[in-house]
């Protein structure tokens, strides 16, 4: 008799999930000498322990604490780049500007980036068929709780000037329901963070509007100001040129507005 299995609305665990996590862990320690003390087998065990045999709608931040401890990492607190709905450009930027870090440039973010995972209550199986969707099923699912946990810790670690890259092509440039809007903004520490600087990335070639005047950006400014953190905003009209100028700042065309 086939065992009844809960059918969730979201995609199942990424295929070869355990192997992917282990391989990424080894790769990360290869690239980052300061993390070579990391025991990837223990990392996988801690990762697995956070969700295996647990109901995938009943995951807590506490479940991820052993993994958080193993992945403890010091990044320069004044070199943090947050992003919302514009991950690819943010990652392209930190690949060029090597002294700045997104969450996915840290070990834990790197391990989980673009992956999905969940287990089943009372069995040691990984569910490759389906996992809970944040909206349709439940918010306390393994993936959402993981990102909430690491995002909170990442924001808490930030200091001085924190940058955030926002997608100017979205109807809500700043979305209160995004991870940035619901977690990171509220976990920046006013006693450490002086300024949040938003970079609004324009999508259209001929888009010359000042998107820093967008109502959602004003809403972000209000939230940040109420937290006793200064706010500044820059339009990035030409993201392609912006990246090019990060690569080659001496280029004569890089003195004009980008």
């Amino acid at each position: 008799v086939p065992r009844w299995r809960q059918q969730w609305s979201g995609p199942g665990t990424t295929k070869r999930f355990p192997e992917t996590v282990l391989a990424r862990c080894v790769k990360y320690t290869e690239i980052h000498p300061e993390m070579r003390h990391v025991d990837c087998q223990s990392v996988w065990d801690a990762f697995k322990g956070a969700f295996i045999s647990k109901h995938p709608c009943n995951i807590t931040e506490e479940d991820y604490q052993p993994l958080m401890k193993l992945g403890t990492q010091t990044v320069p607190c004044n070199k943090i780049l947050l992003w919302s709905r514009i991950k690819d450009l943010a990652h392209q930027f930190t690949q060029v500007q090597r002294d700045m870090f997104t969450l996915e440039d840290t070990l834990l973010g790197y391990l989980a980036d673009d992956l999905t995972w969940c287990g089943e209550f009372n069995t040691s199986k990984i569910n490759y068929q389906s996992c809970p969707d944040w909206r349709k099923d439940c918010s306390n699912n393994p993936v959402s709780v993981f990102w909430k946990t690491v995002s909170r810790r990442f924001a808490e670690a930030a200091c001085d000037v924190v940058h955030v890259m926002l997608n100017g092509s979205r109807s809500k440039i700043f979305d209160k329901n995004s991870t940035f809007g619901s977690v990171e903004v509220h976990n920046l520490q006013p006693e450490k963070v002086q300024t949040l600087e938003a970079w609004v990335i324009h999508g259209g070639r001929e888009d010359s509007r000042d998107l820093c005047q967008d109502p959602t950006i004003k809403e972000l400014e209000s939230i940040i100001s109420k937290r006793n953190i200064q706010f500044s905003c820059k339009n990035i009209y030409r993201p392609d040129k912006f990246l090019q100028c990060v690569k080659n700042p001496e280029d004569s065309s890089c003195t004009s507005e980008i």
Epitope: T29, E30, P33, R36, H37, D39, D45, A46
Partner: antibody, heavy 121, light 107 residues
């Protein structure tokens, strides 16, 4: 088949510099993810980790001994070296080298047979 | 530094017995603990890493368990060739540190 073999002076006097060599085969430090470490064991006593070096020349030392230790490698000749400055009788021990591998943090899986070093005036 | 404490310096056993050796870390090392066997005149031999993973070629009578600060190494049925000194080591952080060792001897 990975094999490691330590060699040293056998005996030396206090205040001298101890030079140790670890020669290995079946292992290449030009291969990403490999490393070699040094551990010592005074006769009848426990083990003490000293230092290790990775393929890309990243080095780690035991903080208690760091000022006296220098680890280096010669990738082409498959050798790792350890120098201990200003030795004392407390440095009398069997010295082992061992392999480490990325991803298993500092788990030393293959060990040499050890070389005995006596510091005596 | 993380101190690894093996409470028993010696343990007496008989062939066929089940024996467990304990090791306590002075702070949480999650599961980053290895166990080594050392026979007289020989170098240490890796048996267990990451608390519970048996190294290649190690007989399955050897097992490891534990997490956090308390770790146990077990031989399910002691053989004559198992009489040796057993060391635990934390591979969680530098400096790597070892327990003082537990010598397994015949009753």
């Amino acid at each position: 088949q990975v094999t490691l073999k330590e060699s040293g002076p056998g005996i030396l006097q206090p205040s001298q510099t101890l030079s140790l060599t670890c020669s290995f085969s079946g292992l290449s430090l030009s291969t990403s993810g490999k490393g070699v470490g040094w551990i010592r064991q005074p006769s009848g006593k426990g083990l003490e980790w000293l230092a290790h070096i990775w393929w890309d020349d990243d080095k780690r030392y035991n903080p208690a001994l760091k000022s006296r230790l220098t680890i280096s490698k010669d990738t082409s000749s498959n050798q790792v070296f350890l120098k201990i400055a200003s030795v004392d009788t407390a440095d009398t021990a069997t010295y082992y080298c061992a392999r480490i591998e990325l991803g298993r943090s500092y788990v030393m899986d293959y060990w040499g047979q050890g070389t005995t070093v006596t510091v005596s005036s | 530094d993380i101190v690894m404490t093996q409470s028993h310096k010696f343990m007496s056993t008989s062939v066929g017995d089940r024996v467990s050796i304990s090791c306590k870390a002075s702070q949480d090392v999650i599961t980053s603990v290895a166990w080594f066997q050392q026979k007289p005149g020989q170098s240490p031999k890796l048996l267990i890493y990451s608390a519970s993973y048996r190294y290649t070629g190690v007989p399955d009578r050897f097992t490891g368990s534990g997490s956090g600060t308390d770790f146990t190494f077990t031989i399910s049925s002691v053989q004559a060739e198992d009489l040796a000194v057993y060391y635990c080591q934390q591979h969680y952080t530098i400096p790597l540190t070892f327990g003082a060792g537990t010598k397994l001897e015949l009753k």
